[in-house]
Every structure is written in structure tokens, then in C-alpha cells.
Interface confidence: low
């Protein structure tokens, strides 16, 4: 299916609006520090060029690959060397090395100021004055902060962002209408970004076999009535889509995602009874809906798996003939029967089954050797079940903030070398698992919790890869994708760690503390907690609780005082001295 001009092909397939949006996202994800106006100029130039190619596919340069065209355009940025340093060296390379070079320089933690939300009236004026620029700015700001955001999904977020302003800027109480919608988009956006980052890490660090295994398990849970052949086709197509998006091929990715949505809606009967309501929606909404669709009901009376995968005398013959297909079928059959298991658990079971067959099919009596393979699954299943049970009990007992604090202490003791902002961010997000998953019925808790934790721990791995400081973190992040969470869970207090020297400056607070939002206050307190644990890794829960309670009381007292700053200046050193004494 070759085209004389790839850029013309994609422009015609996607339409001008989506084409321009995706090119803006691509450029913003590559050159994260460039000003908005610079990117808009580049996008307009690319769009005008694409239109000449639509008019005449034989026109000069229209036959060039998208990587060549986009890379050439990025390399025209005048300030590339000053702004990006060694990334400018990418421009000396030829494709495909140049694109690989750009990909390697994507920054998961760019040094960009946090987005400040202006007053509602200011935003509504900007929206009405120039809707197109307003929405482009949204794409640009999100994309540069989230360089792996799933591009076609970001277009869907932008459409919802536009709809929120269109509705709420006409409302009687604009703020009451708009702010909850913006909060929801922000939270969903962060979650979407983190989920996609795991997909890209899976593909880039562990290869497409790892991603395909994940997809087989997840799609088999979602579509338990679908044939293995059908699931395999969906997995192949989905892998192509995500490989493209993670590789910066955003036009191809969006085009292929649209094709996949079309295929699924045309073949609902052989996929799932749950797709109907998605398939009536417009493209962006439809694709989102299909990705989030609930699990279909499991077929009645599925026979036991043991017959084909344990009792059969042909297991080793079947395994030897087509290892990946046989293991894929095992994973499919197991996953469709277990919507109550996390995908990561299912992948561990498939890994354990594979290891058993590797060992047993070389043994004198293979059947005797693998006869008890399903019994070996029990401890693998019980470990996450127990973990979820214990942590949900703790969450229910403590509430979210204190549960986050317990995790902060736990993870700081495990990996105290990791930077304090990273430990605070990751532990706060780990703590959100409680509110997200513990309220769910038993059968949904494990898939919710463990697969969410995998996403959060991937963030730790991604940040740590940029600035590696802990061999333990490197080991857990790189040895096995499916065992990352159990690896981190198994880490104990790092006995080799030399405690951080006490720094009074770290525990010095000012009156500005009183004007912070509740969330910002929590982050300040949690930052202090991490620093305390780094100073005294062997401090007991009781000691830390005592210090944190004193801290809360000290802040509350000073924020009620008439002269807040004087109170902080006077009470702060007392708090520090008392804390040191309590932890001595």
C-alpha cells in the first residue's frame, strides 16, 4: 500500500485539522523548550507544503519520508544549539538515525514552570478572541510536558477542552461550570500520559514481544468471547499503532488507530457485545470509548484449561512446534477466564508456565514433570491478593494522606538515594491507589491496583533512568517488566545507605506556608517527612508520627498567629530541636 507522497496520503486521510494538531504535538514533544509561536510557524510551513503535495504528488520533495520532512524542519530552528545543547548534533545525522537521536533526547521531566490556571474570565476572553490559537496552546503545553502522550488521544482531550469552554463561558456561573471540568481533564490527562508512558517503555525497553503479551492478556480479559485468532489480529494492529506513536510517527499512528476503530466496529459480533455504544460516536470519541470499554461477560461453561495445557500428552509437541503461539493461546485462555487477575499477574503465570515447559520438555518424563504446574501458580496468585488486602485495610484505617505518608516512609527506607521530589511524587501517586481501587468489589480490586501500581512504578523507573542513583532501582526496573512491582515490594531497608546529614534549612518554614492550597501544604509536609527518613532511616513509625504531628501543630499555630512570620521564626527552631531530640 505505497503512496507516491506519504505526506499527501496522511493529509488526505486525517484532514487538515487533525493533521495540523498532530504535527504540532510531534514538534512540541521533540523540541520541548521552543516557544509556542516558533512551533506554530513550523506547523504552518509543513501544512502549506503538504497541500502542495496533495495538489501534485510529483512536486519537489513530496516523495520524501515524513521523518525526513519533519527532521529537516526541526533542524531549521535557529536556537537549537543554545537551547538544546547536544541535541543539535542529531541534525548532523541521516535518517533513520536522526529520528532515533531526537527520540533519545525526549525529556520526561523537562524543566518547565508548572502550568498556572488564569482567572476564568481571562480564559474565556482568550477562548472567544481566538479559539484556534487557544486550543493549539493547549496541545503545545500538554505535549511539551508529556513527550510520550498518546497523540490521537490528546486530540480527544483537546476536543473535550474546547467543549468545556464553549459550554461554560456562556454559563451564568462560569467558574462553577468550568473548573470541575478542567480538574477532571487534568487528572485524566495525567493518568493517560502515565499509562501511555508504560506502553512506550514496554516497547522500547523490553521489545514488542513484551507489549504483545500484555495486549493478549488485556484484550482477552476485555473480549472473552472473541476467538484467539481475532484477539491476535487486534493485538498485531494495536502493537503497530503504539509502536508508531512511541516512535514519534504520530500521523501514521493516528491513521492506523482510526482504521483499527473502524475494523472493530465492523466486526463487533466476533469481538464483544459491549462495543455498540462506542461505535455510534465520532472518531476521536469512538477510539477513546473502545480503548476504555468494559469487559464483556465471560462465556458460560468454559471447559477446564488443564486438559489442553497439563493433562494432554501433546503439550511438549505443541509447545515445540510453535512456542509463541502456544504460549499466546495459554495466556488468552487463562486471561479470558480471569478478569479478576491483574494483567501483570497473568503475564507472571504465563512466564512460570513457559519456564516449566522449558525445563520439563527436556526431562525424561515431561508429563510427570509438568503435571503439577498449576499448583505452582498458587503462591504467585496469593502474593498480589494479600498485598491488595493488606494495603486496602491500611488505606481504610488511615485515609489517603496518612496512607501516602506510610508509603513515603516505606519507599524512602527502600531506596533513600532517590531524589526527594521523585519520592514524594511517586509515593503520593502510589497512595492514590487506595481511593481508586479499594472501594471496588473484590473481583476488580487486584486488576485495578496492581496494574495502576505498574504505571506509577514505571514513572519512577523513567525518572531514575535519567539520573541513576540506586542500583536497587536499576535492578527492579530493568530485570523484568512483569516483576517490577514484586521486586519493589520485596526491597527492605537499605542497610548500606549512609544517612543524610541534618540540615536545618530543609526544616525551615515561612509564612508563605499559610497561603498554600491543601495539596501544596501536604507536599511540603511530605517533603519534610522524606528528608527526616533520609536523616534517620531507622526511625520508628511512632517517632515519625510524633514529629509529623508536632509539625502539623506548629504550622497550624503559626498560621493562626497575628504575626505569622515572627511565629515561624520563633517556633521553627524549637520544632527542629524537638524533632532532633525525638529522633535521637
Amino acid at each position: 500500500d505505497t503512496h507516491k507522497s506519504e505526506v499527501a496520503h496522511r493529509f488526505k486521510d486525517l484532514g487538515e485539522e487533525h493533521f495540523k494538531g498532530l504535527v504540532l504535538v510531534a514538534f512540541s514533544q521533540y523540541l520541548q523548550q521552543c516557544p509556542f509561536e516558533e512551533h506554530v510557524k513550523l506547523v504552518n510551513e509543513v501544512t502549506e507544503f503538504a497541500k502542495t503535495c496533495v495538489a501534485d504528488e510529483s512536486a519537489e520533495n513530496c516523495d520524501k519520508s515524513l521523518h525526513t520532512l519533519f527532521g529537516d524542519k526541526l533542524c531549521t530552528v535557529a536556537t537549537l544549539r543554545e537551547t538544546y545543547g547536544e541535541m543539535a548534533d542529531c541534525c548532523a545525522k541521516q535518517e533513520p538515525e536522526r529520528n532515533e537521536c531526537f527520540l533519545q533526547h525526549k525529556d520526561d521531566n523537562p524543566n518547565l514552570p508548572p502550568l498556572v490556571r488564569p482567572e476564568v474570565d481571562v480564559m474565556c476572553t482568550a477562548f472567544h478572541d481566538n479559539e484556534a490559537t487557544f486550543l493549539k496552546k493547549y496541545l503545545y503545553e500538554v505535549a511539551r510536558r508529556h513527550p510520550y502522550f498518546y497523540a490521537p488521544e490528546l486530540l480527544f482531550f483537546a476536543a473535550r477542552y474546547k467543549a468545556a469552554f464553549a459550554e461554560c463561558c456562556q454559563a451564568a456561573d462560569k467558574a462553577a461550570c468550568l473548573l470541575p471540568k478542567l480538574d477532571e481533564l487534568r487528572d485524566e490527562g495525567k493518568a493517560s500520559s502515565a499509562k501511555q508512558r508504560l506502553k512506550c517503555a514496554s516497547l522500547q525497553k523490553f521489545g514488542d514481544r513484551a507489549f504483545k503479551a500484555w495486549a493478549v492478556a488485556r484484550l482477552s480479559q476485555k473480549f472473552p468471547k472473541a476467538e484467539f485468532a481475532e484477539v491476535s489480529k487486534l493485538v498485531t494492529d494495536l502493537t503497530k499503532v503504539h509502536t508508531e506513536c512511541c516512535h514519534g510517527d504520530l500521523l501514521e499512528c493516528a491513521d492506523d488507530r482510526a482504521d483499527l476503530a473502524k475494523y472493530m466496529c465492523e466486526n463487533q459480533d466476533s469481538i464483544s457485545s459491549k462495543l455498540k455504544e462506542c461505535c455510534d460516536k465520532p472518531l476521536l470519541e469512538k477510539s477513546h470509548c473502545l480503548a476504555e470499554v468494559e469487559n464483556d461477560e465471560m462465556p458460560a461453561d468454559l471447559p477446564s484449561l488443564a486438559a489442553d495445557y497439563v493433562e494432554s500428552k501433546d503439550v511438549c509437541k505443541n509447545y515445540a512446534e510453535a512456542k509463541d503461539v502456544f504460549l499466546g493461546m495459554f495466556l488468552y485462555e487463562y486471561a479470558r477466564r480471569h478478569p479478576d487477575y491483574s494483567v501483570m499477574l497473568l503475564l507472571r503465570l504465563a512466564k512460570a508456565y513457559e519456564a516449566t515447559l522449558e525445563k520439563c520438555c527436556a526431562a525424561a518424563d515431561p508429563h510427570e514433570c509438568y503435571a503439577k504446574v498449576f499448583d505452582e501458580f498458587q503462591p504467585l496468585v496469593e502474593e498480589p491478593q494479600n498485598l491488595v488486602k493488606q494495603n486496602c485495610e491500611l488505606f481504610e484505617q488511615l485515609g489517603e494522606y496518612k496512607f501516602q505518608n506510610a508509603l513515603l516512609v516505606r519507599y524512602t527506607k527502600k531506596v533513600p538515594q532517590v531524589s526527594t521530589p521523585t519520592l514524594v511524587e511517586v509515593s503520593r501517586n502510589l497512595g492514590k491507589v487506595g481511593a481508586k481501587c479499594c472501594k471496588l468489589p473484590e473481583a476488580k480490586r487486584m486488576p485495578c491496583a496492581e496494574d495502576y501500581l505498574s504505571v506509577v512504578l514505571n514513572r519512577l523507573c523513567v525518572l531514575h533512568e535519567k539520573t541513576p542513583v540506586s542500583e536497587k532501582v536499576t535492578k527492579c526496573c530493568t530485570e523484568s517488566l512483569v516483576n517490577r512491582r514484586p521486586c519493589f515490594s520485596a526491597l527492605e531497608l537499605d542497610e548500606a545507605y549512609v544517612p543524610k546529614a541534618f540540615n536545618a534549612e530543609t526544616f525551615t518554614f515561612h509564612a508563605d506556608m499559610c497561603t498554600l492550597s491543601e495539596k501544596e501544604k501536604q507536599v511540603k509536609k511530605q517533603t519534610a517527612l522524606v528528608e527526616l527518613v533520609k536523616h534517620k532511616p531507622k526511625a520508628t513509625k511512632e517517632q515519625l508520627k510524633g514529629v509529623m504531628d508536632n509539625f502539623a501543630a506548629f504550622v497550624e499555630k503559626c498560621c493562626k498567629a497575628d504575626d505569622k512570620e515572627a511565629c515561624f521564626a520563633e517556633e521553627g527552631p524549637k520544632f527542629v530541636a524537638a524533632s532532633q531530640a525525638a529522633l535521637a
Epitope: 476467538e227 484467539f228 459480533d269 462465556p299 471447559p303 489442553d308 509437541k317 505443541n318 510453535a322
Partner: nanobody, 115 residues
Framework: EVQLVESGGGLVQPGGSLRLSCAAS????????MSWVRQAPGKGPEWVSA????????RYAESIKGRFTISRDNAKKTLYLQMNSLKPEDTAVYYC????????GSQGTQVTVSS
């Protein structure tokens, strides 16, 4: 591309017999267990019978035990269902599937039992 093509269905009187065939292509037929599934008008799919890859282990739904026999010929890449003592309630479209799926991955073959 995986393809499964069923044949052998038709109209038969109660107590009669039929033999369904399923020709497979596009995958290593001999490596996979196979099943027969049926879907009666207005009802959901119902698993009927399964056979392991080597043809040694067979399983049947309670409703057809003793009347239907599943078999396979790996050399011919074909799955069979011998149906004896047919009853009106066996009327359905019959599908063959890879593994133990109860979804319709193929066109199926219509079996109608009526006097």
C-alpha cells in the same frame, strides 16, 4: 490468515444423523485444541464439544453427551462432528473454533432438525 470453513449442515428429521466438517488453514492446525460451538436462533453461543491437539482427549456438553462425537484428522487439517439421534433442540448454526472459544470466527453451517 486464519480461516475456518464449516460444511455438512442441512435439514434432517428428528432421530437422524449429520456429519459436520471444518477445514482449517493459516495456522498450525495440529498444535491446537479445537471446539464446536453452536448458536440457536435468539440465543447466545453454546459450547458443544472440544478435542485436544492430538485427538486423544475429547469433552462434551451434557446436552449432547452420548449422541455427538468429535474427531479430527491433522493430516487433512479438518475437524469433524458426528451428530446422531438429533433432536429439534439441536437446531442451530454450528461453528468450529480454535481452542475453547465460544465466539463466532467463521460463517458456520446451519443444522435444522424438524419433521
Amino acid at each position: 490468515e486464519v480461516q475456518l470453513v464449516e460444511s455438512g449442515g442441512g435439514l434432517v428429521q428428528p432421530g437422524g444423523s449429520l456429519r459436520l466438517s471444518c477445514a482449517a488453514s493459516g495456522f498450525t492446525f495440529g498444535s491446537f485444541g479445537m471446539s464446536w460451538v453452536r448458536q440457536a436462533p435468539g440465543k447466545g453461543p453454546e459450547w458443544v464439544s472440544a478435542i485436544d491437539s492430538g485427538g486423544t482427549d475429547t469433552r462434551y456438553a451434557e446436552s449432547i453427551k452420548g449422541r455427538f462425537t468429535i474427531s479430527r484428522d491433522n493430516a487433512k487439517k479438518t475437524l469433524y462432528l458426528q451428530m446422531n439421534s438429533l433432536k429439534p433442540e439441536d437446531t442451530a448454526v454450528y461453528y468450529c473454533t480454535i481452542g475453547q472459544s465460544t465466539s463466532r470466527g467463521s460463517q458456520g453451517t446451519q443444522v435444522t432438525v424438524s419433521s
